[in-house]
């Protein structure tokens, strides 16, 4: 149904080996990054914190899908993870490696 | 070509009458809102200011399109416009009505 397909956060586990980042990220082997999936149809729900532009774009798309694309479901808040990584050959621990995991999705 | 279809800002003129907002926005009759269109394929260009999460998601999509959706081309910077509008029956001027026009697009 439309509601089930609406913009929301869904699981996405990243294996660093799979994307070739194990060459510099020593630990962890992977992490739950999540992703934002689903549609942003008008009217845009408040919890998706739409900008005025997103509301207008969604409204234009509703009236004429040729004129404007839909607003897009994207991360609006990201959180850090901790990593052990190689920095110029030095194994370094970083408690907060920013912008790695989605905590909130919204329509933009 | 792929480059021509890459994430960028494109024109989108909004006519307030068309979207029914002429009932409360007195002037202007419309404005250039722009929109963000195009794909966010890996590797994501620097000018599209991708987050680490967007880079990872694009990379996962490249390797397995079933596992993750593409990163999305969205407004990353919005600018205000000036409007004359009705506020409880009073015609009011707002110099900076925020978040109305796209000034930059990026991959998120």
């Amino acid at each position: 149904n439309a509601k089930g397909n609406y913009c929301k956060r869904t699981p996405l586990y990243i294996d660093f080996k799979e994307i070739g980042w194990d060459s510099w990220i020593i630990a962890p082997p992977g992490y739950e990054a999540y992703e934002c999936r689903g549609v942003c149809n008008y009217p845009l729900a408040e919890h998706l914190t739409p900008t005025k532009h997103a509301i207008i774009q969604a409204l234009v798309h509703l009236k004429n899908s040729q004129k404007a694309s839909k607003a897009c479901c994207v991360p609006t808040k990201l959180e850090p993870i901790s990593i052990l990584y190689l920095d110029k050959g030095v194994v370094t621990y970083k408690f907060k490696y920013e912008g790695m995991a989605v905590s909130e999705c919204g329509c933009r | 070509n792929a480059k021509g279809n890459y994430c960028k800002r494109t024109p989108l003129y909004i006519d307030f009458k068309e979207i029914g907002w002429d009932s409360w926005i007195i002037a202007p009759p419309g404005y250039e809102a722009y929109e963000c269109r195009g794909v966010c394929n890996y590797p994501l260009a620097e000018h599209l200011t991708p987050t680490k999460h967007a880079i990872i998601q694009a990379l996962v999509h490249l390797k397995n399109s079933q596992k993750a959706s593409k990163a999305c081309c969205v407004p990353t910077k919005l600018e205000p416009i000036s409007i004359l509008y009705l506020d409880k029956g009073v015609v009011t001027y707002k110099f900076k009505y925020e978040g109305m026009a796209v000034s930059e697009c990026g991959c998120r």
Epitope: Y13, I26, A27, P28, P29, G30, Y31, E32, A33, E79, I81, S82, L84, L86, G89, V90, V91, T92, Y93, F95, M100, A101 | -
Partner: antibody, heavy 115, light 111 residues
Framework: QVQLQESGPDLVQPSQTLDITCTVS????????VHWVRQPPGKGLEWMGT???????DYNSAFKDRLAISRDTSKNEVFLKMDSLQTDDTAVYFC?????????WGQGILVTVSS | QFVLIQSDSMSTSAGSTVKLSCKRS????????VYWYQQHEGRSPTTMIY?????PDGVPDRFSGSIDSSSNSASLTINNVQIEDEAVYFC??????????FGGGTKLTVL
């Protein structure tokens, strides 16, 4: 305030499985990492594994085949499960919070492996 | 895989300065940060030094960490040693194999 508390059996039979729970309070498991470290009587510290804040798990390869670490973020619990215990697995088992550094430890639980 | 080698025990007198050593068996000591932990008898460890030379809040500035490339060792120096400094001190480092490696510990006795 921040606390970590290990709970589990004091005594385990050889060849049996050890289950320890680390219950945390005062912080989120999605923000901080949790180490499992053990210390045999009169001996040094040995890192066993880490439950990372992003959900990834690392193990000391010395335990990899018989050790499993997991968590329940809603209950603020981290679990250690180790199979096929032998007498030399007798130790104090600690969980510890890793932020910018290891800033909080549980008080430890002494597990004796004996028949 | 490297190991971190610490002397089993050391004695010192109150008020003096003592330097505890942590030698890396293979590879460069500078290729990962060294952390130092203090453990009193029957207690959980506490971090004294992290990222090689940083002190957590509450750790006296009598404690300092350093690296000596010539001996491929990290050192924990304690100035003006106090009775309450009597404890076992463990160094710890990182590797790409066993991610978190502890030294065997040095028991410091204050006379």
């Amino acid at each position: 305030q921040v606390q970590l508390q290990e709970s589990g059996p004091d005594l385990v039979q050889p060849s049996q499985t050890l289950d320890i729970t680390c219950t945390v309070s005062g912080f989120s498991l999605t923000t901080y990492n949790v180490h499992w470290v053990r210390q045999p009587p009169g001996k040094g510290l040995e890192w066993m594994g880490t439950m990372w804040n992003g959900g990834g798990i690392d193990y000391n390869s010395a335990f990899k085949d018989r050790l499993a670490i997991s968590r329940d973020t809603s209950k603020n619990e981290v679990f250690l499960k180790m199979d096929s215990l032998q007498t030399d697995d007798t130790a104090v088992y600690f969980c510890a919070r890793l932020g910018y550094y290891v800033d909080y430890w549980g008080q430890g639980i002494l597990v004796t492996v004996s028949s | 895989q490297f190991v971190l080698i610490q002397s089993d025990s050391m004695s010192t007198s109150a008020g003096s300065t003592v330097k505890l050593s942590c030698k890396r068996s293979t590879g460069n000591i500078g290729s990962s940060y060294v952390y130092w932990y203090q453990q009193h008898e029957g207690r959980s460890p506490t971090t004294m030094i992290y990222d090689g030379d940083k002190r957590p809040d509450g750790v006296p500035d009598r404690f300092s960490g350093s690296i000596d490339s010539s001996s491929n060792s990290a050192s924990l120096t304690i100035n003006n040693v106090q009775i309450e400094d009597e404890a076992v001190y463990f160094c710890q480092s990182f590797s790409s194999g066993i991610k978190f490696i502890f030294g065997g510990g040095t028991k410091l006795t204050v006379l």
